[in-house]
Interface confidence: low
């Protein structure tokens, strides 16, 4: 009832501002009255608040359990030894850029960008990806030159499906090579990149689909398609993973007016797959080899077969003509990695399950910065990690195998009372050699009480103190995999719990 | 009955703005891009651009890029084409016109609002 | 942007006389549809569409009213020339971006 006439008040309040406003009475009188408003709208705010408010993390986001984060770090730890392995650099860039920087540079998909509400001064956007911001960053500290990854959280004003791995919020691992080099060999190596993280995260069998943005415009071109318009049908092309030819073409046609025998001339093209001999067959193709874009985009991948051959991991790519990514800013080669779900019967293909790493060539990108617009080629891949956790958390889920949150190498833990001040004794002599080391915050903790932390943890040994071993001088260890329990010198304790744990010599 | 109603007439001098709106009724708002063409006094079409509502999707005449700017609110369908830095050159009727499908590829133009005349004088 | 040549620039046609109006243009066709309209503007009147896509008769239009041609070449054929009919009529193109119009053709009752 409170609620109700509070309510009434805002109505009438509302219509005695708007009436004042029609009479152009003076704005003394006008600003009065619209503060009680507020006021009111406050009390009514609050009020709400009390009866509705929910505790939950906002749409499209998520929070990270100990469980989920020890995933993402082994994730996360399998991607950057192979990114440092190929000899890149890393950076950073902040989360938010100038609205202008992002403008223009993703086609359809910038309406999911979002905006932060103007603080009265620059309008802001958070970044959609890596590679936008990167290229920024090229131009405006004039580099030619680089091979960087960068590892950071992107915002997308999607509607997702969570429960398939997308978010709203969600991180990329990106790695990208910029420079004049040399035609293809950065593309391959970034493929061999892609193809040893999917191989080192054991994550199912997946294949690599490779086109060039060129051999998709001079096919739009050949088939008829206008120019002004190969973008938006790039996207209805894109579609073919997931639905098929007969709805991409219903799309085309009912949706996009494209005339049916230009979408049937685009079938026949986007429905061929295959390797390096389609490459070749296509060069011959009487229609697409008369055409200049086609024919480059044809004379590159033809190259970089040979070169997928020399690195070992041709028999991970196909040549897909339906392969059309999104952004507007690829220029060249373009791959996309699908995890593959073996057939049900035999003879089938495989089936590819979603995206979970793609990249390509984008040499215009820099170019949009540069106030001369000096190009800087660029090629470079990105991980949907994100698809990888939620991959790697229901494969950990299946097999009921315990993740260790922690990294603790030793617990120490006393079998009697009154032996709290051997333990932080004991415990802060293994911190400061380096050692990861815990122990129970009470007086007098029950032995069983100690142990049962530490086999729950999944901590490897345990050191225990009793009143006989401080007389001795000796300190009990027992490994939680061997249940074996030895008498160690106290002044030899922490180079057998290193070579117990195959820890290399550090402090900190 | 499908119907677009035009802003009235409007007087600028060179180097003001104008912006001028298309009130859509009588269909789905959203389905269908809204173009826009003027008409010098004596003179032919000359299409300047469209936009649709349905995603915001925009096609431009490169002529009027720098200066058209084709807005539309799909709360009260209602379309708007703002074209600054008036010129004498610029004074036309401007239509607004139904395009035959949204996002269509070629779509001829089937329903048009009344014009608005825009005189730019000094 | 594509040049939309039409002809003649006026045509003066008596009642009941059939008026033809031609419009060239570099190719605005595919093998299935051509991308041709006609439009009819009536003095202080906005344009309204006559003929879409080269023959197809727009709805309400009278059948007096036909459309032919693909490739370059597309006319407009008035069989019989009607009072009401005196305008000027426009063909129009959306093949590619821009649209662009023919300058149009004014036809009067002779």
């Known amino acids: 009832a409170d609620r109700a006439a509070l309510e009434e008040l805002v109505r009438l309040q509302g219509a005695h501002v708007r009436g004042l406003k029609e009479q152009k009475a003076s704005a003394e009188q006008i600003e009065e009255e619209v503060t009680k408003l507020l006021k009111l709208k406050a009390q009514l705010g609050q009020d709400e608040g009390k009866q509705k408010f929910v505790l939950k993390t906002p749409k499209g986001t998520r929070d990270y359990s100990p469980r989920q984060m020890a995933v993402r770090e082994k994730v996360f730890d399998v991607i950057i030894r192979c990114f440092k392995r190929h000899g890149a650099e890393v950076i950073d860039t902040p989360v938010f850029e100038l609205k202008e920087t992002l403008t223009g540079k993703y086609g359809e998909d910038s309406k999911l960008i979002y905006d932060l509400k103007d603080q009265g001064g620059e309008l802001l956007s958070l970044r959609y990806d890596l590679t936008v911001p990167f290229a920024r960053y090229l131009a405006m500290n004039k580099l030619t030159n680089i091979k960087r990854y960068h590892i950071a959280k992107v915002y997308r004003r999607d509607n997702p499906a969570m429960t398939r791995g997308r978010y709203r919020e969600f991180y990329q691992c990106d790695f990208d090579i910029a420079g004049q080099f040399d035609p293809m060999i950065p593309d391959a190596e970034c493929l061999k990149i892609m193809c040893e993280i999917l191989s080192s995260l054991q994550i199912g069998n997946f294949l690599v689909k490779v086109n060039d943005r060129r051999i998709l415009d001079g096919m739009f071109a050949v088939c008829g398609v206008p120019d002004s318009k190969f973008r938006t049908i790039c996207s209805s092309v894109d579609k073919l993973d997931k639905v098929s030819w007969e709805e991409v073409k219903n799309e085309m046609v009912g949706e996009k007016g494209l005339a049916p025998e230009v979408a049937d001339r685009i079938g026949d093209y986007v429905q061929q797959h295959g390797g390096v001999s389609l490459v070749e067959q296509l060069l011959q193709d009487p229609k697409l080899s008369q055409n200049k874009q086609a024919v480059e985009g044809l004379g590159d991948l033809k190259l970089l077969f040979e070169y997928l051959i020399l690195f070992g991991i041709d028999d991970k790519i196909s040549f897909d003509l339906s392969l059309a990514r999104g952004l507007d800013y690829y220029t060249g080669v373009i791959y996309e990695a699908v995890l593959l779900q073996m057939p049900t019967q035999a003879g089938e293909e495989p089936l590819g399950v979603g995206s979970i790493a793609a990249g390509g060539r984008y040499d215009g990108l820099v170019g949009m910065f540069d106030p001369k617009g000096r190009k800087v080629p660029c090629v470079g891949l990105s991980i949907g990690v994100e698809r990888i956790f939620s991959i790697v958390e229901q494969r950990l889920e299946a097999s009921e195998e315990k993740v260790r949150t922690t990294e603790t190498q030793v617990l120490v833990a006393s079998a009697q009372k009154k032996l709290l001040e051997e333990r932080l004794k004991l415990v802060s002599e293994l911190w400061d050699a380096g050692i990861k080391a815990e122990l129970l915050y009470k007086k007098n903790p029950k032995l069983l009480n100690q142990l049962q932390y530490w086999e729950e943890a999944g901590i490897p040994l345990v050191a225990i103190i009793g009143e006989q071993e401080l007389r001795d001088g000796v300190i009990k260890l027992r490994s939680v995999a061997s249940r074996e329990e030895v008498d160690v010198r106290r002044e030899d304790l922490v180079e057998e719990i290193r070579r117990r744990t195959n820890q290399p010599l550090s402090t900190c | 009955q499908v119907q677009l109603v035009q802003s009235g007439a409007e007087v600028k001098k060179p180097g003001a703005s104008v912006k001028v709106s298309c009130k859509a009724s009588g269909y789905t708002f959203t389905d269908y891009c809204i173009g826009w063409i003027r008409q010098a006094p004596g003179q032919g079409l000359e299409w300047m651009g469209d936009?649709?509502?349905?995603?915001?999707?925009?096609n431009d005449n490169e002529k009027f890029k720098d200066r058209a700017t084709m807005t539309a609110d799909t709360s009260t369908s209602t379309a708007y084409m703002e074209l600054s830095s008036l010129r004498s050159e610029d004074t036309a009727v401007y239509y607004c016109?139904?395009?035959?499908?949204?996002?269509?590829?070629?779509?001829?133009?089937?329903?048009w609002g009344q014009g608005t005349l825009v005189t730019v004088s000094s | 942007d594509i040049v939309m040549t039409q002809s003649p620039d006026s045509l003066a046609v008596s009642l009941g006389e059939r008026a033809t109006i031609n419009c060239q243009s570099q190719s605005v066709s595919t093998s299935t549809y051509n991308y041709m309209h006609w439009y009819q503007q009536k003095p202080g009147q906005p344009p309204k569409l006559l003929i879409k896509y080269a023959s197809n008769l727009e709805s309400g239009v009278p059948d007096r009213f036909s459309g032919s041609g693909s490739g370059t070449d597309f006319t407009l054929t008035i069989s019989s020339l009607q009072a009401e009919d005196v305008a000027t009529y426009y063909c129009?193109?959306?093949?590619?971006?821009?649209?662009?119009f023919g300058g149009g053709t004014k036809v009067e009752i002779k």
């Open positions: 129009g193109h959306s093949y590619e971006i821009p649209w662009t």
């Open positions: 016109a139904r395009g035959e499908e949204q996002l269509g590829l070629r779509n001829a133009m089937d329903y």
């Open positions: 936009i649709c509502p349905g995603d915001t999707y925009t």
